[in-house]
């Protein structure tokens, strides 16, 4: 049995301003138990885009039904894209911990580029 992998199949996605961007992410295993988070950018200055565990992210919806037991799809859709949303997005798996969850593995990243709104 192989260790969990985080798969972001697209290296890049291009979306027109005002549209929604779908960023795909899948896990290869149900364990370790722990939440998924999406970030824009890497390192200490990365921006949290979506936290499965907590928080309010009005522009973000999950593509699949996360409450299904065997769900391994953690793709998200971000609505009303603007040029400020451009960047590289990382799907990150955390594993449950005590007292805090521990970052476990990150996807390779998907670069989002934003095209000008068609006139």
């Amino acid at each position: 049995e192989d260790e969990l992998q985080v798969i972001q199949p697209e290296k890049s996605v291009s979306v027109a301003a005002g549209e929604s961007a779908t960023l795909r992410c899948a896990m290869t295993s149900l364990i370790p138990v722990g939440p998924i988070m999406w970030f824009r950018g890497a390192g200490a200055g990365r921006e949290l885009i979506y936290n499965q565990k907590e928080g309010h992210f009005p522009r973000v919806t999950t593509v699949s039904e996360l409450t299904k037991r065997n769900n391994l799809d953690f793709s998200i859709s971000i609505s009303n894209i603007t040029p400020a949303d451009a960047g590289t997005y990382y799907c990150v798996k955390f594993r449950k911990g005590s007292p805090d969850d521990v970052e476990f593995k990150s996807g390779a990243g998907t670069e989002l580029s934003v095209r000008a709104k068609p006139s």
């Epitope: 049995e1 260790e3 149900l30 364990i31 138990v33 499965q52 037991r69 449950k96 911990g97």
Partner: antibody
Amino acid sequence: AVTLDESGGGLQTPGRALSLVCRGSGFSISSYNMGWVRQAPGKGLEFIASIGSDGSSTHYAPAVKGRATITRDVGQSTVRLQLNNLRAEDTGTYFCAKDAYQCSYATCNDYLDTIDAWGHGTEVIVSS
Amino acid sequence: ALTQPSSVSANPGETVKITCSGDNSAHYYYGWYQQKSPGSAPVTVIYYNDKRPSGIPSRFSGSASGSTATLIITGVQVEDEAVYFCGSADSSNPAIFGAGTTLTVLG
């Protein structure tokens, strides 16, 4: 303090149904995965069934799949194991178990890999 | 499957190590459960690989590396005599247990 108290065991007739209840106190069962582990006489611990903190995710051991149903009642702070069509090999002590991880989201599923509390157990004897 | 020795023995005051080996590296957490007599309630002495619940003496510690977990009892005492089960999970089993290790404290 966290406590788990099981009830419902006793002498049972083969082919009949059994309902075991685990009552938890000192914590909210809506935030933790819960489950049942049994021990046959002279044997080790055997996972039987678990239910996720979301109340909908469940898993059953092959030995009881199709015969067992695990449910919970948050208001009563109870977890129930219904086991139908009892067999002699269902004989043993049934323990309620609680996972340590407080989970408020879906991907916890129904895992019990960090058990921090056990009940005292309830003995089940299946015999004609 | 989790594999552990069927028995270990030690004199009071000695250090005891009990190992638990998984059949793959995807057992992310291990726990150790003490049972003093058959059918009695197990007591968790270690969970999250190395966390000790409140009320468990500090002589109990745990570690995990790769697919192997170890329970360490430093300065074993007579009252530690029991069967110790390791537990974990894999992607298709929410909980799995080893067959148990009987610890005998001599003297």
